[in-house]
C-alpha cells in the first residue's frame, strides 16, 4: 500500500502552500524506502536516495516555480511514481447568504472569501434551532442536521424544502480543499429572509374615455404558494415616458387605476410584492409594462355597473370647484380617490 495519504482531489496530485516547506511523497514505494527525485522533463537529480528523507522530497519555501510534475524512482531505477505539485491556500470561511421567495422553502448561496487556487468543494447542511429545557443537553433528532441539497452542475446554491416559517435554522457551509476545511455557520429565520419574487403578468390598459387614467393589473408570482393564510401586499410605481421620477402607490388588491396620468404620453408601470405582515423585504420590481391613456370620448354604451359620465372629459377651469366623485360600489378599485379633479395635461 502507498505511504502517501490521498488528499481529496484528483489522483496523483499533492498539495502545498506557497512560502511553506512542502513534502512530496513517492506513492509507489514502501514508507521509508530511499528514492531519487527528478523534475519531470529535467534530467538532473533533485534529491538522491542518500538524503535520509526516505520516500519524501522536501521543497523548502515552495513557490510557483516548484509547481509541476516530479518523478520518483527506487534505488534500482524502477519508477516509484509521478507526483504533480499544486500550490494554494487552505480554505477560508465562505461568504454565505440565504433568501426565500416563499414561506415554505429557502435557498442559500455561497462564495469563497479567499481564492485558494485548489480544487474546492462545499459541504452544506442545516438544522432547526430549538430552545430546549435547561435540564436537556441532548439535541432532539428532529432538529437535524440534515443535508442541504445542492443544485446540480456546480451552482453554488442549496435549497431547503418544507421549512417552517416560524422556526430558526442554522446553516452550515463548509469549504473543503486538500489543505483543510473551514466552516461558516449562519442563523436564519424565514421571516427575515423572505423576499417574494416580483409579481407576474403586469398589464397596463387605458380606460376608454378617460385620458388621465390607466388600469394596471397583475398576478401573484408563480413561486408563491396558493394558500390563503400568507398573502402579499403590493407597491406600484408609474411615470410618464422621459420623466425621471416615479410616483408610488400601495394598491389593496391585484389591480390599480391611476388617475393622474399625463394624457397622450406612454407610461411605464412596475410592481413589487411583500408579505402582507411585513416579513422580510420587498421583491425586486417586476419588468416594466407600458400603457398610454385613451383619447376621445366615453363609449355610447353604458357599462353594466352604471353611467360614469355622459360628456367627454375636459380640462376644468382652474377656479372651478371639483365635481363630485361617482359612486362605484360594484367596482370600488376602478377609480382612485387620490385626485378629486382629473386634469388633462397641456403639453407645451
Amino acid at each position: 500500500s502507498s505511504p502517501c495519504p490521498q488528499a481529496w482531489g484528483p489522483p496523483g496530485v499533492q498539495y502545498g502552500q506557497p512560502g511553506r516547506s512542502v513534502k512530496l511523497c513517492c506513492p509507489g514505494v514502501t514508507a521509508g524506502d530511499p528514492v531519487s527525485w527528478f523534475r519531470d522533463g529535467e534530467p538532473k537529480l533533485l534529491q538522491g536516495p542518500d538524503s535520509g528523507l526516505g520516500h519524501e522530497l522536501v521543497l523548502a519555501q515552495a513557490d510557483s516555480t516548484d509547481e509541476g510534475t516530479y518523478i520518483c524512482q527506487t534505488l534500482d531505477g524502477a519508477l516509484g511514481g509521478t507526483v504533480t505539485l499544486q500550490l494554494g491556500y487552505p480554505p477560508a470561511r465562505p461568504v454565505v447568504s440565504c433568501q426565500a421567495a416563499d414561506y415554505e422553502n429557502f435557498s442559500c448561496t455561497w462564495s469563497p472569501s479567499q481564492i485558494s487556487g485548489l480544487p474546492t468543494r462545499y459541504l452544506t447542511s442545516y438544522r432547526k434551532k430549538t430552545v430546549l429545557g435547561a435540564d436537556s443537553q441532548r439535541r432532539s433528532p428532529s432538529t437535524g442536521p440534515w443535508p442541504c441539497p445542492q443544485d446540480p452542475l456546480g451552482a453554488a446554491r442549496c435549497v431547503v424544502h418544507g421549512a417552517e416559517f416560524w422556526s430558526q435554522y442554522r446553516i452550515n457551509v463548509t469549504e473543503v480543499n486538500p489543505l483543510g476545511a473551514s466552516t461558516r455557520l449562519l442563523d436564519v429565520s424565514l421571516q427575515s429572509i423572505l423576499r417574494p419574487d416580483p409579481p407576474q403578468g403586469l398589464r397596463v390598459e387605458s380606460v376608454p374615455g378617460y385620458p388621465r387614467r390607466l388600469r394596471a393589473s397583475w398576478t401573484y408570482p408563480a413561486s408563491w404558494p396558493c394558500q390563503p393564510h400568507f398573502l402579499l401586499k403590493f407597491r406600484l410605481q408609474y411615470r410618464p415616458a422621459q420623466h425621471p421620477a416615479w410616483s408610488t402607490v400601495e394598491p389593496a388588491g391585484l389591480e390599480e387605476v391611476i388617475t393622474d396620468a399625463v394624457a397622450g404620453l406612454p407610461h411605464a408601470v412596475r410592481v413589487s410584492a411583500r408579505d402582507f405582515l411585513d416579513a422580510g423585504t420587498w421583491s425586486t420590481w417586476s419588468p416594466e409594462a407600458w400603457g398610454t391613456p385613451s383619447t376621445g370620448t366615453i363609449p355610447k354604451e353604458i357599462p353594466a355597473w352604471g353611467q360614469l359620465h355622459t360628456q367627454p372629459e375636459v380640462e376644468p377651469q382652474v377656479d372651478s370647484p371639483a365635481p363630485p366623485r361617482p359612486s362605484l360600489q360594484p367596482h370600488p378599485r376602478l377609480l382612485d380617490h387620490r385626485d378629486s379633479v382629473e386634469q388633462v395635461a397641456v403639453l407645451a
Epitope: F38, P43, K44, G48, Q73, G77, A78, L79
Partner: antibody
C-alpha cells in the same frame, strides 16, 4: 535475470528506414525507462532518447528528433526504435538500455545497422 | 548541449598501478556525472553514478569524485580486466551526453 535481446544486423540503403527491436525479460517492463543509444565505428556513445515505462512519454536528443521514433509494445515487453531517412553516417551499433530516468544499467547486445548504397 | 572533455585520450599503465581519469564539463553540472566501462565487442557497463556513488557488483577499487565541472575516476590498483575504454556521462540537462572516452591500455 534481466535480459535485453535486440534484433539482428541490418543493411539499408540511404533514404530508407530501419526499425530495431529490443525484447525485455526478467523484470517488470513497465517499471523502467528504456533508452536508445548508438556507437559509430571507433567513436564514442550518443544518446538518442528514452521512453517512459508506463505512459510512453519520450525525451529525444534534438539531433534525432525528426528522424527517430521510440515506441513500446507492453503486451510483448518490446521496445522499438525506428530511424528514418538513413544516411551513411548512421552506420553504427544501436543499443537499447534499461535504466532509470537518466542512467543506463542493463544493455542489449547491440544491433549493427549498415547504411550503404 | 553540455560538452564533456575526457583526458587523457589514452592512459598507459601497468597492473597494480593507480589510474586517474579526468572528465571536465563545459558548464557546472553539480554531481550529475556518471562513469561507464566498455570492453571491445561489449556493451558499456555502469561503474559510478552521481560522481561518487558506487554501484552494486562493481569492485571497490573503482571510486569517483568531483562536483561542478571537474570529475575524476580513480582505479586504486589496476587489474588486468580493467584495461578498457572509460566514458563519462552527464545527466544535468538534455540531451544526455558522453565524453569521447579515455582508453586505458596496458603499458
Amino acid at each position: 535475470q534481466v535480459q535485453l535481446v535486440q534484433s539482428g544486423a541490418e543493411v539499408k540503403k540511404p533514404g530508407a528506414s530501419v526499425k530495431v527491436s529490443c525484447k525485455a525479460s526478467g523484470y517488470t517492463f513497465t517499471n523502467y525507462w528504456m533508452h536508445w543509444l548508438r556507437q559509430r565505428p571507433g567513436q564514442g556513445l550518443e544518446w538518442i532518447g528514452n521512453i517512459g515505462p508506463s505512459d510512453s512519454k519520450t525525451h529525444y536528443n534534438q539531433k534525432f528528433k525528426d528522424r527517430a521514433t521510440l515506441t513500446v509494445d507492453k503486451s510483448t515487453s518490446t521496445a522499438y526504435m525506428e530511424l528514418s531517412s538513413l544516411r551513411s553516417e548512421d552506420t553504427a551499433v544501436y543499443y537499447c538500455a534499461r535504466g532509470d530516468y537518466v542512467l543506463f544499467t542493463y544493455w542489449g547486445q547491440g544491433t549493427l545497422v549498415t547504411v550503404s548504397s | 548541449d553540455i560538452v564533456l572533455t575526457q583526458s587523457p585520450a589514452t592512459l598507459s599503465l601497468s597492473p597494480g598501478e593507480r589510474a586517474t581519469l579526468s572528465c571536465r564539463a563545459s558548464q557546472s553540472i553539480s554531481n550529475n556525472l556518471h562513469w561507464y566501462q566498455q570492453k571491445p565487442g561489449q556493451a558499456p557497463r555502469l561503474l559510478i553514478k552521481y560522481a561518487s556513488q558506487s554501484i552494486s557488483g562493481i569492485p571497490a577499487r573503482f571510486s569517483g569524485s568531483g562536483s561542478g565541472t571537474d570529475f575524476t575516476l580513480t582505479i586504486s590498483s589496476l587489474e588486468p580486466e580493467d584495461f578498457a575504454v572509460y566514458y563519462c556521462q552527464q545527466s544535468y540537462s538534455w540531451p544526455l551526453t558522453f565524453g569521447q572516452g579515455t582508453k586505458l591500455e596496458i603499458k
